[in-house]
């Protein structure tokens, strides 16, 4: 049979997902119901590995599968009739498959830094990079991330900095390739904690009796993490700035003369039965010298006529010595200190003085 050469196909339309493309086209020849079509699909920069698809007669659409996400392809479509008589020129169209979304990403806190490390494995296929969005309340930040390669299963990471401590962030990462954006991958991550900001003021100390005082102080600001505990520290010495080293000293050490500074009382804030919001400042009043015991710390009676100053340590993380039961490990804790109060001088023991006078 004799056939005239088919005219070229036109109006090629492509719809894609990550690994497939559905192509449709038109041919306006009267004889087009007798045509089949030959499709050549070639990945950009890889002409040696073209895929060929031949349609059934009269079919003007085809789906090509097993494509690579986020990649650029060119399709050529020839109309053909009879014994391989083809249109002179193919219809041509370039297209991109959709990029693959990141399966998931993990967050890690950075110790004592207001930052998060995000870690992920590269999604399959090609990508030009990623859009990163970080949001918390009214604050947000959008930035680009570099492209990655999925070939060797490498773990990729980026550090998100300039965040706030102990704050929950909504994070979204969107894969980009060929000007297309995948569905975003989301996670909610919370930044870590650090030493609390030291308070401006110092505690208020007042004499109650010849062997006890009352220490009043305001709760520390919780912007670096929730305050987990307070330690009330007394000294009879020169009131320099306290360090974490003093947290190991107890009333017993003080009585033995091993230290002029010691922890007399410990408050676990969880015991107060309510959580402290960032702006809420709680007031504390501690009776020092009432012979109570908190964990490894004995709140022993004070010395009549003694001169005492008080300071408060606030903890966002309190760690105890594994071998020294009930004593704080200052080096492992997240702690800061108030300034020392003014000194208070205790009165003499009137009863003892009276007794002494009678003898």
């Amino acid at each position: 049979a004799q056939y005239t050469r088919p005219s070229n196909v036109s109006n090629i339309d492509v719809s894609t997902n990550t690994t497939a493309a559905t192509l449709s086209w038109q041919n306006f020849d009267d004889a087009s119901p007798t045509y089949s079509y030959c499709l050549l699909i070639e990945k950009a920069g890889n002409s040696s590995n073209a895929t060929q698809v031949v349609t059934d007669i009269g079919i003007t659409d085809a789906t090509v599968t097993e494509l690579i996400p986020g990649s650029s392809y060119t399709v050529e479509i020839f109309a053909q009739v009879g014994d391989g008589i083809k249109s002179l020129e193919p219809g041509r169209k370039s297209f991109c498959t959709d990029p693959a979304s990141m399966a998931s990403f993990d967050c890690e806190v950075v110790p004592k830094e207001p930052a998060l490390v995000l870690k992920w494995t590269c999604p399959p296929g090609a990508n030009a990079g990623f859009e990163l969005e970080v949001s918390s309340g009214a604050w947000n930040n959008a930035t680009h991330l570099e492209s990655c390669s999925s070939e060797n299963g490498t773990e990729y990471r980026t550090e998100v900095t300039y965040l706030n401590f102990s704050t929950s962030y909504n994070i979204s990462i969107t894969t980009v390739s060929c000007g297309k954006m995948a569905a975003p991958t989301r996670n909610t991550c919370t930044t870590g904690i650090t030493d609390p900001p030291p308070p401006d003021g110092s505690p208020n100390i007042t004499s109650v009796s010849h062997n006890s005082v009352k220490v009043k102080f305001s709760g520390f600001e919780a912007s670096h993490g929730p305050i987990k505990a307070y330690a009330v520290i007394l000294t009879t010495g020169e009131a320099g700035h306290p360090s974490a080293d003093v947290l190991k000293y107890t009333y017993e050490d003080f009585k033995k003369g091993a230290s002029d500074t010691y922890v007399t009382y410990l408050i676990r804030t969880e015991e107060k039965g309510r959580s402290q919001s960032l702006s809420e400042v709680l007031k504390y009043e501690i009776d020092v010298g009432n012979e109570s015991t908190t964990l490894g710390y004995y709140n022993g009676k004070l010395e009549p006529l003694g001169s005492y100053r008080a300071c408060v340590a606030g903890f966002t993380n309190i760690t105890f010595h594994p071998q020294n039961k009930g004593l704080i490990d200052g080096a492992e804790s997240y702690v800061s200190f108030s300034r020392y109060s003014d000194a208070v001088s205790l009165p003499q023991d009137v009863a003892a003085a009276h007794h002494h006078h009678h003898h």
């Epitope: 030009a128 969005e133 930040n141 680009h144 979204s172 954006m181 569905a183 975003p184």
Partner: antibody, heavy 117, light 107 residues
């Protein structure tokens, strides 16, 4: 095929308001960062505003901050630009665009906003 | 704001000629640079993003290169349909900014 169609432009007096819309089709609108770009008559291009996909974070050029509001309705695949306290220097053709990795990939045909008394 | 200085402001080229347009950024933009073509009365069209990947359907006679603060667009084998205004644009830092444009005409 990606299609972006802007509407809502027109003549408005200084101090007046206008709301532009951009109807998107041919792609998954909710996945995309979107932006408005404008072009004053016979002038160059100027980025105006930007909105992200996940949390709808917004960014504006300084000259429109506090006067313009970009928003999106993913269910309707539509991008908006509410323009208040309009000034003569806002006169321009306004284009909406997809904006992955900081590049304006697909553009609408534009809608003309004229601010004049 | 990051300034983009485009040069030349205008040029004319003969059919088949190769032309180059330069774009200089006031600071490092880490290859977040795009090139656009705009024809009279039409919307801009993306040619190149991220300094060198060619956008879908853009003829291969267009190419982009550069890094840091210096970028260029090259058009080989100038064709009549290449006439128009070309803009560079940085997408590294807000506010995103455009160059002033280069008008390309056929000689």
């Amino acid at each position: 095929e990606v299609k972006l169609v802007e509407s809502g432009g027109g003549l408005v007096q200084p101090g007046g308001s206008l709301k532009l819309s951009c109807a998107a089709s041919g792609f998954t609108f909710s996945n995309y960062y979107m932006a408005w770009v404008r072009q004053a008559p016979t002038k160059g291009l100027e980025w105006v505003a930007y909105i992200t996909n996940s949390f709808g974070s917004t960014y504006y050029r300084d000259s429109v901050k506090g006067r313009f509001t970009i928003s999106r309705d993913n269910a309707k695949s539509t991008l908006y630009l509410q323009m208040d306290s309009l000034r003569s220097e806002d006169t321009a053709t306004y284009y909406c665009s997809t904006v992955p990795l900081g590049a304006f990939v697909y553009w609408g045909q534009g809608t003309l906003v004229t601010v004049s008394s | 704001d990051i300034q983009l200085t485009q040069s030349p402001a205008s040029l004319s080229a003969s059919l088949g000629e190769t032309v180059s347009i330069e774009c200089l950024a006031s600071e490092d933009i880490y290859s977040y640079l795009a090139w656009y073509q705009q024809k009279p009365g039409k919307s801009p069209q993306l040619l190149i993003s991220h300094a060198n990947p060619l956008h879908d359907g853009v003829p291969s006679r267009f190419s982009g290169s550069g890094s840091g603060t210096q970028y260029s667009l090259k058009i080989r084998n100038m064709q009549p349909e290449d006439e128009g205004v070309y803009y560079c644009q940085q997408g590294y830092k807000f506010p995103y900014t455009f160059g002033a444009g280069t008008k390309l005409e056929l000689k």
